[in-house]
């Protein structure tokens, strides 16, 4: 997911509808004016705000990367929702990119969970039921795998 290209200092002057802040805050879909007197609406498809706020600028909409699909567009009150394409997933510890799901489990393991946009396939040992760490398995150890992928330890 990437931020919009427009740099903060290059943004055009807002021409949006204005209203007054309530106790110094503006509603979702707005930001506060430079003198704090008005609430200015965010620009649809360009920026947004999700909460009551005193932000001087609305938050820039994110754009889905290649390898992602847009589940819902950016509105003035909600950011774009992007999801990894089928066959890929995004881990919590590396959210910046979608990774390819493994095509199979190492020998001696069985698949208990499918590839989803949020997780790789899940493998467990046939006997013990211990989960596999999630690294891509070595070719010689796999039931079904793409060539050249490195081995991984089991937990």
């Amino acid at each position: 997911i990437t931020q919009q290209d427009l740099a903060p200092q290059q943004r055009a002057a807002p021409q949006q509808k204005r209203s007054s802040p309530s106790e110094g805050l503006c509603p979702p879909g707005h930001h506060i004016s430079e003198d704090g007197r008005d609430c200015i609406s965010c620009k649809y498809g360009q920026d947004y705000s999700t909460h009551w706020n005193d932000l001087l600028f609305c938050l820039r909409c994110t754009r889905c990367d290649s390898g992602e699909v847009e589940l819902s567009p950016c509105t003035t009150t909600r950011n774009t929702v992007c999801q990894c394409e089928e066959g890929t997933f995004r881990e919590e510890d590396s959210p910046e990119m979608c990774r390819k799901c493994r095509t199979g489990c190492p020998r001696g393991m069985v698949k208990v969970g499918d590839c989803t946009p949020w997780s790789d396939i899940e493998c467990v040992h046939k006997e013990s039921g211990t989960k596999h760490s999630g690294e891509v398995p070595a070719v010689e150890e796999t039931v079904t795998s793409s060539p050249g992928t490195p081995a991984s330890p089991c937990s």
Epitope: I1, Q3, P8, I32, N53, D54, F57, L59
Partner: nanobody
């Protein structure tokens, strides 16, 4: 608690330039998201410019864009505001401020109107 001390104000003719400085102490300067605000006589506080702790995200009020430049020197614990092509309407007390509850989204800093730590201000007067 961070303390801020502005300097560099004074009287200048229209079209002239000034450089304001804000020295910070009592905190790790490189972790502070900061900004400049101003208050003209008989008027309310107005946002001028803001800069993220890294200096990567910079914002300006429409009224000063192209004339003012914000910068920081983390090694010197100092925030700057270079003001050029000054106009009579720029006359105000200029305040350096720290955003102690910064908003970050997608790694980008977004300034607020309600900065919470303030300096004592420095007066800038623009008159012929």
């Amino acid at each position: 608690e961070v303390q801020l001390l502005e300097s560099g104000g004074g009287e200048v003719q229209p079209g002239g330039s000034l450089r304001l400085s804000c020295a910070a102490s009592g905190s790790t300067f490189s972790s502070l998201d900061m900004g400049w605000f101003r208050q003209a006589p008989g008027k309310g506080r107005e946002f001028v410019s803001a800069i993220s702790r890294s200096g990567d995200n910079i914002y300006y009020a429409e009224s000063v864009k192209g004339r003012f430049t914000i910068s920081r020197d983390n090694a010197k614990n100092t925030l700057y505001l270079q003001m050029s092509s000054l106009r009579a309407e720029d006359t105000a007390v200029y305040y350096c401020a720290v955003d102690s509850q910064p908003t970050y989204s997608g790694g980008v800093y977004y300034p607020r109107y309600g900065y919470d730590v303030w300096g004592q201000g420095t007066l800038v007067t623009v008159k012929p």
